[in-house]
């Protein structure tokens, strides 16, 4: 089976059940339902999944049985629309059920919530988790899939199966260990952090497809795969791009069974043809399916072929540029992107796409000019400032990170971004700026040749979080503009924003700066978030405050928390010293 199946199936549900097996089928249907109906209780979803599974089994036994010929969207949509509390729980989403496919599925997709009103996941004691794991392993693992899927409605479903496998392995190993907590907690922390990163990366892929179209996603994929597989032929890269686009289009569209099935086929194809693709795939291809697909997705770049010819000869100096461009524009631009990307693993994907866009714009203009060759002769000179801008930005920010450390670097970014877009909600500014600040620890340790692809492509993922959160409740025209104008220019657009002079400072509210003894029992991370929340509020009250003023107030605040957390009567200390701190801060900032 290739990724594109030509053979028709009488029953799509039976076909996918047989391809995926019962365990993966059930897991993927649970993920799909939890990503659509994010507020439904676990038990309700399990019931729906069991009903769908039993139905699928009847279709496997007899593909001609009643309703077995229906599309998966029809079957799943009909099942979701049986939920009794749909109107009360989801409001207007219930209106989707009055529509016919494919409009009904599109309607469900539009109601996916990137920031659902769900309680934060609190990790129980290790013994409690191990007991639950041993008592009913299947329910325990289903609950994990459900809780992640409903909080991350665009999580890459086949990858979530891989996370669940690792989650199970962690409990299987650690619940037998002498020190269960020492074994389990670091593994769970790692899974949580990797899971958040995986969710954010996939969210960008879906945004790219849904907001900017298939061509934008394919351009991204050509650039990335050409960097990763520089020895592969252009046609090989093109084939992988086509198949990968199909996989992600399916997953982003809620077609999780098709997506998982096609991803497995793609991994199989890559491993069968690894000699033509990359020398780095050998280890990946020896692993079981879920690990294999994950490994391929993360595989390091292959070595660049020696003696690659200069690009200028055929893409600038040749008199045939316009002729070649006119004969097949997208193939010619695709080859340009492929050739440029395979020579530049040191560039970010978004930079490569900016260069390709500049090249395309130049050809569109010049090929209509009186002397095309004279017109496009200097096109590569236009690339220089585009390359230098991210290089300089990364150099400056890595220097700042090394000087300040992660927490204070995050604070610098919090101030910077709050001044740029003060209308954005404080929790969003804190979350996004904290993630932006992590670029330092993640990328600044790398040598020059790896810094830009690490940093700028990571920043694209984080800024997409800002864009999807802002889209739900738009409050800033500047954010909307940077998010919607150009996918590849989002980071330069945000970087170029200066202080918003039109912003009217927020009214001072002492309650915002009132703290209690509960801060003392928080983890270091939670305590940082409290302080960073206060910092954002401070900037919203006094956007013209200088770095020195803000630093002085934050230092006083840190000293205040430290002092009161050591006090015998913590609550009294917070009440009395807090009032003094607010007064002193107001005076220092001239509020």
């Amino acid at each position: 089976r290739g990724v594109f199946r030509r053979d028709a199936h009488k029953s799509e549900v039976a076909h996918r059940f047989k391809d995926l097996g019962e365990e993966n089928f059930k897991a993927l249907v649970l993920i799909a339902f939890a990503q659509y109906l994010q507020q439904c209780p676990f038990e309700d979803h399990v019931k729906l999944v069991n009903e769908v599974t039993e139905f699928a089994k009847t279709c496997v036994a007899d593909e001609s049985a009643e309703n077995c010929d229906k599309s998966l969207h029809t079957l799943f949509g009909d099942k979701l629309c049986t939920v009794a509390t749909l109107r009360e729980t989801y409001g207007e989403m219930a209106d989707c059920c009055a529509k016919q496919e494919p409009e009904r599925n599109e309607c469900f997709l539009q109601h996916k919530d990137d920031n659902p009103n769900l309680p934060r996941l609190v990790r129980p004691e290790v013994d409690v988790m191990c007991t639950a794991f041993h008592d009913n392993e299947e329910t325990f693992l289903k609950k994990y899939l459900y809780e992640i899927a409903r909080r991350h409605p665009y999580f890459y479903a086949p990858e979530l199966l891989f996370f669940a496998k690792r989650y199970k392995a962690a409990f299987t190993e650690c619940c037998q260990a002498a020190d269960k907590a020492a074994c389990l907690l670091p593994k769970l922390d790692e899974l949580r952090d990797e899971g958040k990163a995986s969710s954010a990366k996939q969210r960008l892929k879906c945004a790219s497809l849904q907001k900017f179209g298939e061509r934008a996603f394919k351009a991204w994929a050509v650039a990335r795969l050409s960097q990763r597989f520089p020895k592969a032929e252009f046609a090989e890269v093109s084939k992988l791009v086509t198949d990968l686009t199909k996989v992600h289009t399916e997953c982003c569209h809620g077609d999780l069974l098709e997506c998982a099935d096609d991803r497995a086929d793609l991994a199989k194809y890559i491993c069968e043809n690894q000699d033509s693709i990359s020398s780095k795939l050998k280890e990946c291809c020896e692993k079981p399916l879920l690990e294999k697909s994950h490994c391929i997705a993360e595989v390091e770049n292959d070595e660049m072929p020696a003696d690659l010819p200069s690009l200028a000869a055929d893409f600038v100096e040749s008199k045939d540029v316009c002729k070649n461009y006119a004969e097949a524009k997208d193939v010619f631009l695709g080859m340009f992107l492929y050739e440029y990307a395979r020579r530049h693993p040191d560039y970010s994907v978004v930079l490569l796409l900016r260069l390709a866009k500049t090249y395309e714009t130049t050809l569109e203009k010049c090929c209509a000019a009186a002397d095309p060759h004279e017109c496009y002769a200097k096109v590569f000179d236009e690339f220089k400032p585009l390359v230098e801008e991210p290089q300089n930005l990364i150099k400056q920010n890595c220097e700042l990170f090394e000087q300040l450390g992660e927490y204070k670097f995050q604070n610098a970014l919090l101030v910077r971004y709050t001044k740029k877009v003060p209308q954005v909600s404080t929790p969003t500014l804190v979350e996004v700026s904290r993630n932006l600040g992590k670029v330092g620890s993640k990328c600044c340790k790398h040598p020059e040749a790896k810094r830009m692809p690490c940093a700028e492509d990571y920043l694209s993922v984080v800024l997409n979080q800002l864009c999807v959160l802002h889209e739900k409740t738009p409050v800033s025209d500047r954010v909307t503009k940077c998010c919607t104008e150009s996918l590849v220019n989002r980071r330069p657009c945000f970087s170029a924003l200066e202080v918003d002079e039109t912003y009217v400072p927020k009214e001072f509210n002492a309650e915002t700066f009132t703290f209690h003894a509960d801060i003392c029992t928080l983890s270091e991370k939670e305590r940082q978030i409290k302080k960073q929340t206060a910092l954002v509020e401070l900037v919203k009250h006094k956007p013209k405050a200088t770095k020195e003023q803000l630093k002085a107030v934050m230092d006083d605040f840190a000293a205040f928390v430290e002092k009161c957390c050591k006090a015998d009567d913590k609550e009294t200390c917070f009440a009395e010293e807090g009032k003094k701190l607010v007064a002193a801060s107001q005076a220092a900032l001239g509020l």
């Epitope: 046609a235 090989e236 093109s238 033509s276 055929d314 097949a328 193939v331 695709g334 050739e339």
Partner: nanobody, 125 residues
Amino acid sequence: EVQLLESGGGLVQPGGSLRLSCAASGNTYLTSCMGWFRQAPGKEREGVSSIYTVGGSTFYTNSVKGRFTISRDNSKNTVYLQMNSLRAEDTAVYYCAAGSPARCRLRDPTTFDYWGQGTLVTVSS
């Protein structure tokens, strides 16, 4: 319509050299991926080397790497295969092929759309 004309085949001793040429006429975009394939008696046709006439990237099958070099002269619409350190196992009919760069894969002859008649290379003492 695209036409491909090979030349340069012949008899050569082991360790010797030959240079094959392939001249293309017709739509240049349809021939902007050009390759050399070979077929020994009783064996399947296998890819030897390919080149993009836009970009100039080259690809080789493992058994000829370091011995064969593919090159092009766009002004003459001609592709060359310089074969050095020839071995008896290189004996075959060598075919020139052309196609779209978005489709042509050296390991798969069916992805090339246009073919020459072939030229015989015999390596023997």
